[in-house]
């Protein structure tokens, strides 16, 4: 028995930040779970982890240097990624694992979300023109 996950097909990070919502066919209320976000077609990089427990505050961390936060809904986890770089444009997959109560449950692999990180274009400000030639 597998949990189904829905994600947006594509998101654009204009300001080097993005909210990626992972929606599950499972209610996480009063469950112990590990929600994670993985980068790349092979999911090789674990970007962020949200650990939830019925008796503790939500814990969010990244072992791979990403700046991330997480928010919990009844049937969703939203990952908020900041300070993304253009070269981190890639496909990102949501994963959910329910550790308690038994039995252990995880998800069918989702279609993923392509996160396109747009670089900040620094335009010269008209208020501070460069030195003009006489």
């Amino acid at each position: 028995n597998k949990i189904l996950v829905k994600q947006s097909p594509m998101l654009v990070a204009y300001d080097n930040a993005v909210n990626l919502s992972c929606k599950y066919s499972y209610n996480l209320f009063s469950r112990e779970f590990r929600a994670s976000l993985h980068k790349g077609l092979d999911s090789a990089v674990e970007v962020c982890v949200v650990y939830g427990n019925y008796s503790q505050q939500l814990q969010v961390y990244s072992k791979t240097g990403f700046n991330c936060d997480g928010k919990l809904g009844n049937e969703s986890v939203t990952f908020y990624l900041q300070n993304l770089y253009v070269n981190q444009t890639d496909i990102y997959f949501c994963k959910i694992e329910v550790m308690y109560p038994p039995p252990y449950l995880d998800n069918e692999k989702s279609n993923g979300t392509i996160i396109h990180v747009k670089g900040k274009h620094l335009c010269p400000s008209p208020l501070f023109p460069g030195p003009s030639k006489p």
Partner: antibody
Framework: QVQLVQSGAEVKKPGASVKVSCKAS????????IHWVRQCPGQGLEWIGC????????NYNEKFKDRATLTVDTSISTAYMELSRLRSDDTAVYFC?????????????WGQGTTVTVSS | DIQMTQSPSSLSASVGDRVTITCHAS??????LNWYQQKPGKAPKLLIY???NLHTGVPSRFSGSGSGTDFTLTISSLQPEDFATYYC?????????FGGGTKVEIK
């Protein structure tokens, strides 16, 4: 209280196999990895591998991948480490320990250790 | 694999001394560094996790610092029960690896 209790000392001949058990109590078995770490006489600590009882997924140190087999029996909250084709340099104390599956970075509870002696 | 290098490998100190042990990782492990104490014939005990967090029940004379590749374990005032071997361990990526250990002996 939280405990990991290991099986007793073993003496084996080179080429044989050994199977060490680690019985967990006092916590939810499926919330934690079980890791195996060994310590050769007078040496440091060496990570062998780990198993997650929830889905029985394993991670192995490449050095032990061909000879170590990690298993669990969730019905009795017990983990096992079998090491085959034993050599004299496998003589060591073998520890089981745990790390949290959701917050996996340190080993907070350890078994008492099992001494395995390989000698002809 | 990430290599963990501890120094010194041994040191002699007196009760009341301030003792510092260092651990160097071969690549950036951010804060995913733990410290353990081991006494002869016993299993290791967790002292510090995530570089600077004191494990439950560990005396406050133990402290940890560092991030990236360089980490330090400090015992502010060495007590008789602190004579032991100390190990660092990286928990950033598998395979998890340990430093070679630092034996703290009585001067």
């Amino acid at each position: 209280q939280v405990q990991l209790v290991q099986s007793g000392a073993e003496v084996k001949k080179p080429g044989a196999s050994v199977k060490v058990s680690c019985k967990a109590s006092g916590y939810t078995f499926t919330s934690y990895y079980i890791h195996w770490v060994r310590q050769c006489p007078g040496q440091g600590l060496e990570w062998i591998g780990c198993i997650y009882p929830g889905n029985v997924n394993t991670n192995y140190n490449e050095k032990f991948k061909d000879r170590a087999t990690l298993t669990v029996d969730t019905s009795i909250s017990t983990a096992y480490m079998e090491l085959s084709r034993l050599r004299s340099d496998d003589t060591a104390v073998y520890f089981c320990t745990r790390s949290h599956y959701g917050l996996d970075w340190n080993f907070d509870v350890w078994g008492q250790g099992t001494t395995v002696t390989v000698s002809s | 694999d990430i290599q963990m290098t501890q120094s010194p490998s041994s040191l002699s100190a007196s009760v009341g001394d301030r003792v510092t042990i260092t651990c160097h990782a071969s690549q950036n492990i951010y804060v995913w560094l733990n410290w353990y104490q081991q006494k002869p014939g016993k299993a290791p005990k967790l002292l510090i996790y995530k570089a600077s967090n004191l494990h439950t029940g560990v005396p406050s004379r133990f402290s940890g610092s560092g991030s990236g590749t360089d980490f330090t374990l400090t015992i502010s005032s060495l007590q008789p029960e602190d004579f032991a071997t100390y190990y660092c361990q990286q928990g950033q990526t598998y395979p998890y690896t340990f430093g070679g250990g630092t034996k703290v002996e009585i001067k």
